[in-house]
Amino acid sequence: TAGTIDTKRNISAEEGGSVILQCHFSSDTAEVTQVDWKQQDQLLAIYSVDLGWHVASVFSDRVVPGPSLGLTFQSLTMNDTGEYFCTYHTYPGGIYKGRIFLKVQESSDDRNGLAQFQ
């Protein structure tokens, strides 16, 4: 087999908290040369085996490279809910993509506060 991507399809996290976005690539033959992370169509970060990690400037205060070839997304807001894509560029063997749906939920503190207010 050329290669496979394994990831959790759906994950959730609390507003204000953090989440790890992780894709696992396995192959007997293909060698990873670069990994791109996207939020919908917007590039979050690039990992190049040669050049290292580069986080898009718009996310640089909230996205931390790692662990491994994943990303840690911090200070989550409700607007961060949506699809995230990892793209593994390999040689030889081409391109492998994984998809994660992140649901950012209202923090438990907010939910408790709202319940008390009602």
Partner: antibody, heavy 122, light 107 residues
Framework: QVQLVQSGAEVKKPGASVKVSCKAS????????MGWVRQAPGQGLEWMGI????????SYARKFQGRVTMTRDTSTSTVYMELSSLRSEDTAVYYC???????????????WGQGTTVTVSS | DIQMTQSPSSLSASVGDRVTITCRAS??????LNWYQQKPGKAPKLLIY???SLQSGVPSRFSGSGSGTDFTLTISSLQPEDFATYYC?????????FGGGTKVEIK
């Protein structure tokens, strides 16, 4: 002003090596990636590789891996491109070019050297 | 490696014409697409980066559009100094490959 000045033309025999220099001035040398691009006579542009002058990390086009070495000297703000085992098809103008954005993924090359002509002939 | 295909390879146009050059990537490159202008015997010059952002000092008659795999460079009103060869380049995945070039000649 921001400037890249390359070394002069070279004539080499097949099998030899050539080392082209590119001296940067007018900006913080370590903050911008430097790429190398070549152009054979009457042909298009060919990307050879790139170097991070601060840490020395490099990425080479697979076509040139094993034959090309890109290095830098931070004390003189100079990057070097050495190409070995030269053949006639390496005859070209070699350009160094600075990446547009500092400390970021190289999004485009905004400042170019004047080019260095390398002729490989027996 | 990502292949970049430009079309046409050459075109003839007159001063004042609207000129469109296209560039297609063999896979999605998001908006990581640059356009360069090169005149004979000179180094290339960056015109457009990130598919549609105009490089400082470049006349506003140059514009870029597209994302994913299909991109366009438009010169809204061709000037005498615009006769040159134009190259696209992707900068998402190393090696940062160039298109084959489009030569814009005087009709």
């Amino acid at each position: 002003q921001v400037q890249l000045v390359q070394s002069g033309a070279e004539v080499k025999k097949p099998g030899a090596s050539v080392k082209v220099s590119c001296k940067a001035s007018g900006y913080t040398f370590g903050s911008y990636y430097m790429g190398w691009v070549r152009q054979a006579p009457g042909q298009g542009l060919e990307w050879m590789g790139i170097i991070d002058p601060s840490g020395g990390r490099t990425s080479y086009a697979r076509k040139f891996q094993g034959r090309v070495t890109m290095t830098r000297d931070t004390s003189t703000s100079t990057v070097y491109m050495e190409l070995s085992s030269l053949r006639s098809e390496d005859t070209a103008v070699y350009y160094c070019a600075r990446a547009r954005t500092p400390s970021s993924w190289p999004y485009g090359m905004d400042v170019w050297g004047q080019g260095t002509t390398v002729t490989v002939s027996s | 490696d990502i292949q970049m295909t430009q079309s046409p390879s050459s075109l003839s146009a007159s001063v004042g014409d609207r000129v469109t050059i296209t560039c297609r990537a063999s896979q999605s490159i998001n908006s990581y697409l640059n356009w360069y202008q090169q005149k004979p015997g000179k180094a290339p010059k960056l015109l457009i980066y990130a598919a549609s952002s105009l490089q400082s000092g470049v006349p506003s008659r140059f514009s870029g559009s597209g994302s994913g795999t299909d991109f366009t460079l438009t010169i809204s009103s061709l000037q005498p100094e615009d006769f040159a060869t134009y190259y696209c380049q992707q900068s998402l995945l190393t090696p940062f490959t160039f298109g084959g070039g489009t030569k814009v000649e005087i009709k």
